[in-house]
Interface confidence: low
């Protein structure tokens, strides 16, 4: 029977800069029941607090609701593991909510095949930002990434959409059923999970153009851009 091993706070994430959750890995239990507590203070302030909510984030977690989340402040936190033989502390973790945002996936992904009379057909995608993100505050610049692949293919084709919430792709395989997903990230932060896949059947008469892909932003009030295959690969994010 020994004191508990050193725990480790391994991840903190916020969906929207208004709340956040941190998770820790327990160390060895020393063969005895072990209690864990997370304590924190805000850098530049002095009073240390205990985790306000050990439940919401699941086992070995601490959730900070709106009332306990301060923007632009660094939180200094550590986990204390205690059993009958003694205690051990994790290393201190410094957390700035601004840099741990991982949004929910974008919503309402709509995918359509457009076949205008005067232009080549294209695949048109549209989506909405996650509901928890208030873009009006100016706190967020959300960037989007789209991926798509034929249903039976192993490899995804990925496109960086910038801040657009619409995207158009010309070069697709006729007659194939495609899966399409979108994800987002704030300018400082983590990519969301991919949205649920949307399926779209590409018609057999879809005209494919290998040399260039036309991405039209006219619906967004922008200009048409002729983007080469090389340029698209430059925007490819892994």
């Amino acid at each position: 029977q020994l004191p508990p091993g050193k725990p480790e706070i391994f991840k903190c994430r916020s969906p929207n800069k208004e709340t956040f959750t941190c998770w820790w890995r327990p160390g060895t239990d020393g063969g005895l029941p072990t209690n864990y507590s997370l304590t924190y203070h805000r850098e530049g302030e002095t009073l240390m607090h205990e985790c306000p909510d050990y439940i919401t984030g699941g086992p070995n977690s601490c959730h900070f609701g709106k009332q306990y989340t301060s923007m632009w402040r660094t939180y200094v936190m550590m986990v204390n593991a205690t059993n009958q033989m003694g205690s051990s502390f994790s290393d201190e973790l410094y957390v700035d909510v601004t840099y741990i945002v991982q949004p929910d996936p974008p919503l309402e992904l709509t995918v359509e095949v457009k076949q205008p009379e005067d232009r080549k057909p294209y695949l048109w995608m549209k989506w909405s930002p996650p509901t928890l993100i208030d873009l009006k505050t100016g706190w967020f610049t959300l960037l989007y990434e789209i991926r798509l692949k034929p249903e039976k293919a192993a490899e995804w084709e990925t496109h960086f959409a910038g801040q657009q919430t619409e995207f158009k792709i010309l070069s697709l395989h006729p007659g194939q059923k495609y899966l399409v997903q979108v994800r987002c990230k704030p300018d400082h932060g983590y990519w969301s999970a991919w949205s649920p896949a949307t399926f779209i059947q590409i018609p057999s008469d879809f005209i494919m153009n290998d040399e260039q892909k036309l991405i039209s932003e006219e619906d967004l009030g922008g200009e048409q851009k002729l983007i080469s295959e090389e340029d698209l690969h430059h925007h490819h994010h892994h």
């Epitope: 240390m48 009332q67 301060s70």
Partner: antibody
């Protein structure tokens, strides 16, 4: 059990000096900020100042800045308040307090009387 | 400095009464507020921190609420041991400042 025991209070002349001590037990002293708070007879509580875990930062209320110095000795679990240029209005009970996770813990206080 | 005011400065109540004490900050302090109880000749005792989190071992009849500048401490059913003076304190910015206190005595 957290315990804080203050000592060093007593009678001092205006302009004189006193050094208060606070010995801590029952928690990891070096992990926490420490504060001094005082209470004039029959009056409310006044925050005097505090000191960071490693002693590298102190903060003071304006009325004592330049006259009082807070220090600590983590090896001895001890907190100190050096009071110079004492004034009548410094009279009161002086408490040391830990700013611990679940709120503050306080000692029982030591009385400082500044009078000629 | 942030000024803290409390009202009322004193109140008389009976055992079983519900009592509410108000604390107001001169500027926004978010939820950086503590409540303390002090009995004559004794050190203050921490009741609530971060405006609404009950200190370990404090009876659930005590509750705190508020955010920004206006805060309340409520004792839902006053017990004989609750007759004391109650202080709020802000720790948003230095210097930390206490309210002047509210004395709760027996009617």
């Amino acid at each position: 059990e957290v315990q804080l025991v203050e000592s060093g209070g007593g009678l001092a002349q205006p302009g004189g000096s006193l050094r208060l001590s606070c010995v801590a037990s029952g928690f990891t002293f070096s992990t926490y900020w420490m504060s001094w708070v005082r209470q004039a007879p029959g009056k409310g509580l006044d925050w005097v100042g505090n000191i960071k875990q490693d002693g590298s930062e102190q903060n003071y209320v304006d009325s004592v800045r330049g006259r009082f110095t807070i220090s600590r000795d983590n090896a001895k679990n001890s907190l100190f308040l050096q009071m110079n240029s004492l004034r009548a209005e410094d009279t009161g009970v002086y408490y040391c307090a830990t700013l611990l996770t679940k709120g503050d813990y306080w000692g029982q206080g030591t009385l400082v009387t500044v009078s000629s | 400095d942030i000024q803290m005011t409390q009202s009322p400065s004193s109140l008389s109540a009976s055992v079983g009464d519900s009592v509410t004490i108000t604390c107001r900050a001169s500027q926004d302090i978010s939820n950086y507020l503590d409540w303390f109880q002090q009995k004559p000749g004794k050190a203050p005792k921490s009741l609530i921190y971060a405006a609404s989190i009950l200190q370990g071992g404090v009876p659930s009849r005590f509750s705190g609420s508020g955010y920004g500048t206006d805060f309340t401490l409520t004792i839902s059913s006053l017990q004989p041991e609750d007759f004391a003076t109650y202080y709020c304190r802000q720790y948003k910015t230095y210097p930390f400042t206490f309210g002047p206190g509210t004395k709760v005595d027996i009617k």
